[in-house]
Interface confidence: low
């Protein structure tokens, strides 16, 4: 048999809306544009499941969040001009009141500085468990000029509107419930949603092209790619920060800092195709 490796392209689309109601944000709707960051990635997508928001930051002077390195008794404890790797800004050298009894070193920074000591639990967007992910995958075996897509020819528009992937009942539906993806990998979505993580959606296109083209079918499997060692639980999960900038009525620059925790879904497409070739047979 002659063999060839798969060439693939993937696009994704997430659907789902979440509702939150907190004292800080009030009643709020979260849609795809809010929680899929960025809007497009290659063979991957990130769904925000938890968040720490620091609203209305402006450039200025403010006390650091108290921790072992920032708590001070007097200015002597604060080195002016220093900017530690874990600090939120550049130290002014002053020791100022963080609250009634605690003093911390003052920094020039985006103020107020972020307090990420307590990650929301349960996850802020716990409703993401029921969001759905459509994976569109086109594959090509160049050696045999064979191409196919995972939305199979006999999948109707009606079926696509209502189906959810299930290994037993709907093994070729390309729409996945996020909670099921994590569950199929043997993990709890709600646990993973708190601090984030990385999930792999594996699409296997092993095809014997001596058989009919209709028999070349995608097979889906799922695994957690960031599985952490219970014994070594340093820096767990997956998160990053970004900011949304705007100006207040007076024209001063402000921002909302977002520390986004979430699940990155990596779509990993692999496969080999084989086809009988008379030439190697004759040579042998």
């Amino acid at each position: 048999q002659e063999t060839d490796s798969v060439v693939s392209s993937v696009t994704t689309k997430v659907k789902g809306v979440a509702v939150t109601n907190t004292s800080k944000l009030g009643f709020r709707i979260w849609d795809v544009a809010d929680y899929v960051i960025p809007a497009q990635e290659e063979n991957s997508l990130f769904v925000m499941t938890n968040v720490i928001l620091t609203m209305n930051q402006t450039q200025g002077l403010c006390p650091e969040i108290p921790d072992a390195t920032t708590v001070c008794k007097s200015d002597a404890s604060c080195t002016a001009g220093s900017a530690g790797t874990h600090s939120n800004g550049v130290s002014t050298g002053r020791c100022v009141a963080f609250n009634g009894s605690v003093k911390t070193c003052e920094v020039a920074a985006w103020c107020p500085v972020e307090d990420d000591t307590h990650v929301p639990q349960p996850a802020f967007l716990k409703a993401a468990e029921n969001f759905t992910l459509l994976v569109k995958n086109n594959i090509w075996y160049p050696k045999f000029n064979f191409s196919k897509r995972n939305i199979l020819p006999n999948i109707t528009t009606t079926y696509l509107k209502s189906c959810i992937y299930d290994a037993k009942t709907d093994p070729f539906c390309p729409i996945f419930r996020l909670g099921k993806i994590v569950e199929n990998a043997g993990h709890s979505f709600q646990d993973m949603a708190v601090e984030g993580g990385i999930m792999g959606i594996q699409v296997n296109w092993d095809c014997n092209l001596d058989r009919a083209a209709s028999l070349c079918l995608p097979r889906y499997s799922f695994r957690r790619l960031d599985t952490r060692d219970v014994e070594h639980n340093v820096s767990p999960g997956y998160n990053f920060r970004f900011a949304k900038y705007y100006r207040d009525l007076a024209g001063n620059e402000q921002r909302t800092l977002i520390k986004a925790y979430g699940i990155r879904f990596d779509i990993i497409v692999f496969g080999k195709a084989g086809k009988f070739d008379i030439i190697p047979t004759m040579i042998n």
């Epitope: 199979l152 020819p153 006999n154 037993k168 093994p171 070729f172 092993d206 014997n208 001596d210 058989r211 009919a212 083209a213 209709s214 028999l215 070349c216 079918l217």
Partner: antibody, heavy 119, light 107 residues
Framework: QVQLKESGPGLVQPSQTLSLTCTVS????????VHWVRQPPGKGLEWMGG???????DYNSALKSRLSISRDTSKSQVFLKMNSLQTEDTAIYFC?????????????WGQGTLVTVSS | DIQMTQSPPSLSASLGDKVTITCQAS??????IAWYQQKPGKAPRQLIR???ALVSGTSSRFSGSGSGRDYSFSISNVESEDIASYYC?????????FGAGTKLELK
Amino acid sequence: QVQLKESGPGLVQPSQTLSLTCTVSGFSLTRYDVHWVRQPPGKGLEWMGGIWGDGSTDYNSALKSRLSISRDTSKSQVFLKMNSLQTEDTAIYFCTRSLDYSGDGFGYWGQGTLVTVSS
Amino acid sequence: DIQMTQSPPSLSASLGDKVTITCQASQNINKYIAWYQQKPGKAPRQLIRYTSALVSGTSSRFSGSGSGRDYSFSISNVESEDIASYYCLQYDNLPYTFGAGTKLELK
């Protein structure tokens, strides 16, 4: 809903040709493959051959020399022709289709038609 | 052609028993195996596809497993309606081939 129905003569003379028709409804022959499976009385199942959505055919190597499968998509019919029949070809002949997606076995079956080869 | 060796040819069970049927392929069939139930005078009915995926409407008492060349099919808590013949089918390679069948009877 998906239905398949076999029709043809119940009795065929030895050395003659068998012609069977499978009339389908509820799906398009250009989308799905249809296969023929037979079962001699009291024995097991044997895949004979099939015609794919694109019109290509495949046959069981043991029957290939005397078997032909074709179709008329406008009439939603699949035809089986097998020549040089012998008594060991006496069997129930089923036409079948894959379940939801081509390639995961045979999910839909006709009720079968008994063909007896005898003089 | 791929040979499917199905065993046992027949099986006696009491109601409530668990029974297991095996099929061994003459080469790796990459999990492309389906299991069928056939009652006398009826067409076969597909119960399982792709080794372990239950076809819609199939009782969860039926299950399948295996990989490579070796596959098995089980019925837990046998009921009288399960009395039938059972066949495996490999569809990894043409020609498709069935196992010789297993006849399940009541003790």
